[in-house]
Interface confidence: low
């Protein structure tokens, strides 16, 4: 390999190497490559010189394209027409020259808050590109359509948000924007304008005409309406909230909803239960009043009791099934049917039957196994499912079984 | 290195007055806004007051709202509360702190403090 | 108003996670040992200010904010604070008294 290389001047983004050549193996050195490593670069990295070939002849290159203010270290690789030799050992860690900041931070952009805030957010500048010590920004901005910017300087290169909390921001209004950077070398570019809105007023009037109704012993259904008087807030969606009658309101569940929508389902409740519901406005600001409480019981659960003693029986290509009648307690409800769960061993998806019956009469094909299970079903929801039933491929046109 | 050293605590009537101070040094004193923040004895920290950089905006907790009043004097490097109509309630001791950044404020922010100076309420 | 839980425990080298809730976008953290003044060990959310432990993390889901002490060493044993702006005035959580076992 060639030995190693000496810098022997650097500015902001050049570099002027030379090296001594390395025994060449009996085959003359045809070209040179220049490689640099960065804190900042995944291993060596192939850079751009002047000259941009350097023949096995030249031992001095300046190495061009470099970022201001970072620490470089540089090797050289030599070639000849059997192959790429080993790389020389690597030069002296050297620090390029500062200079003023080129790169604006990315994405610029912002918006939510609170009330009289203007938010405004962007991307850092990373470090290596960020050209000198004494790195920072410059945010400014204006109510869109005037005339003067207001400026703040930031001192921090890992600024990346900046808040304006003035009661003279009105919600919901658009300002220009924009993010510049500096160094200790003097200020660089600002980034293209973008217009990024003030905070919104959370919305001021709360839902109307609520309205709530038990599903099952686990389900209910919330209905609403928009407010009915002129709003100021954006209203983004409505957060509705929910708490049993023996816990405290503070302790309420909530549940959003995004859009215009204006109902929802709460699911996974307990049966037999008072529930309390409330229902507000929402947007990037807040909630806004809450609607009136409206109350709603859950349905009793369903029955605990499985259907049991199930017996089946074929014939032709019917499979007749038999079971005893399911008594509900007296805090569940009801049994309004039962349903029976079917499907082939090898089909993932189930088929089902309703019937108020405690029997059923299944049209299936007998070249497969089957497997069935059967649950009731009230109006607090579907009630223990018998245990699965496995109906073999039958050959023969009779058989039975329990 | 940010220094932040308060003075003018001490036991005052209800009803009475105490003027704190805070001497910074160590930063760019106009850049930054500032914090009274107190901890009452055995109790967790309470926001009380901020100011702007410049001084021209100021924020209050509720419970001091009217009667206490935050001011700078860049010149002087130095923070001031004015605290009037003073209560038991008002007894802790008072933290001067610094927000992070120049443009942070809030109490997510504040990345120096004082060592605390003890204000004592009590007739 | 920011809502803390008022103890935790952890053993030595175990992870604890400390939990804030409330209204606030941004949140910070800070330490507090007893006779001494707070320290931000965590600022908006998620950022570490130079001089703190990587051991400490901050982050943030919708109205809740938490910090994890991953290893948490017997010098970690504190009074731990968030604090941030409710949407009209910045307050500080009640704190959470943190034990190492």
């Known amino acids: 390999p060639p030995e190693a290389v000496t810098i022997d001047e650097i500015t902001d983004t050049t570099a002027q190497l030379s090296w001594r050549p390395g025994p060449d193996n009996h085959s003359p050195i045809t070209m040179y490559v220049i490689q640099a490593r960065t804190p900042f670069s995944v291993g060596w990295q192939a850079v751009s010189t002047v000259p941009e070939l350097i023949d096995g002849k030249t031992f001095t290159a300046t190495v061009v394209g470099l970022n201001p203010w970072v620490e470089y270290e540089f090797r050289t690789v030599a070639a000849n027409v059997i192959g790429i030799g080993e790389p020389s050992r690597p030069s002296e860690k050297r620090r390029t020259e500062e200079a003023l900041p080129e790169v604006t931070p990315a994405n610029v952009s912002g918006g939510g808050g609170s009330k009289s805030e203007l938010v405004i957010t962007w991307e850092t500048v990373p470090e290596e590109l960020q050209n000198g010590r004494g790195f920072g920004y410059v945010v400014a901005f204006r109510p869109y359509g005037k005339m003067i910017w207001m400026l703040t300087v930031l001192a921090s290169a890992d600024a990346s948000r900046y808040v304006f909390r003035n009661e003279s921001v009105h919600p919901f209004s658009p300002f220009e924007v924009k993010v510049g950077v500096f160094n200790n070398k003097g200020e660089g570019p600002f980034s293209p304008t973008t217009v990024v809105y003030s905070a919104e007023e959370e919305p001021t009037k709360p839902p109307a005409s609520i309205f709530a109704r038990s599903l099952s012993a686990t389900d209910i259904e919330v209905f609403w309406a928009s407010p009915l008087e002129k709003n100021r807030g954006r209203i983004q969606g409505y957060e509705v909230k929910y708490w049993r009658h023996e816990d405290k309101e503070e302790n309420a569940r909530k549940i959003r909803t995004v859009g215009n929508q204006t109902s929802t389902k709460i699911t996974n409740l307990k049966g037999s239960v008072l529930y309390h519901l409330a229902v507000k406005a929402y947007n990037s600001a807040g909630t806004g009043p809450s609607s009136a409480t409206v109350n709603v019981t859950t349905r009793k659960p369903p029955p605990s009791q499985p259907p049991g003693n199930i017996i089946w029986n074929s014939s032709d290509s019917k499979i007749i099934l038999n079971w005893d009648q399911v008594k509900a307690l007296d805090n569940e409800s009801e049994v309004k049917g039962y349903k029976v769960l079917y499907r082939w061993n090898r089909q993932s998806s189930t088929s089902v039957i309703e019937t108020n019956k405690t029997s059923v009469e299944l049209s299936l094909p007998f070249d497969e196994d089957y497997i069935i299970e059967i649950k009731p079903f009230s109006d607090g929801g579907d009630g223990s499912s018998s245990e699965q039933i496995r109906i073999p491929k039958i050959s023969n046109a009779y058989a039975r079984g329990s | 290195e940010v220094q932040l050293l308060e003075s003018g605590g001490g036991l005052v009537q209800p009803g009475g007055s105490l003027r704190l101070s805070c001497a910074a040094s160590?930063?760019?004193?106009?850049?930054?806004?500032m914090f009274w923040v107190r901890q009452a004895p055995g109790k967790g920290l309470e926001w009380v007051a901020e100011i702007s950089g410049g001084g021209g905006s100021t924020w209050y907790a509720p419970a001091v709202k009217g009667r206490f009043t935050i001011s700078r004097d860049n010149s002087k490097n130095t923070l001031y509360l004015q605290m009037n109509s003073l209560r038991a309630e008002d007894t802790a001791v008072y933290y001067c702190?610094?927000?992070?950044?120049?443009?942070?404020?809030?109490?997510?922010?504040?990345?120096?403090w004082g060592q605390g100076t003890l204000v004592t309420v009590s007739s | 108003e920011l809502t803390q839980d008022p103890a935790v425990s952890v053993a030595l080298g175990q992870t604890v996670r400390i939990t804030c809730s409330g209204s606030?976008?941004?949140y910070g953290w800070y330490q507090q040992k007893p006779g001494q003044a707070p320290v931000l060990v965590i600022y908006d959310n998620t950022n570490r200010p130079s001089g703190i432990p990587d051991r400490f993390s901050g982050s943030s889901s919708g109205n809740t904010a938490s910090l994890t002490i991953t290893g948490a060493q017997a010098e970690d044993e504190a009074d731990y604070y968030c604090g941030g702006y409710d949407g009209s005035t910045d307050v500080f959580g009640g704190g959470t008294k943190l034990t190492v076992l």
């Open positions: 702190a610094k927000s992070r950044d120049t443009w942070s404020y809030g109490a997510a922010t504040i990345d120096a």
């Open positions: 160590g930063f760019t004193f106009s850049s930054f806004n």
């Open positions: 606030s976008g941004s």
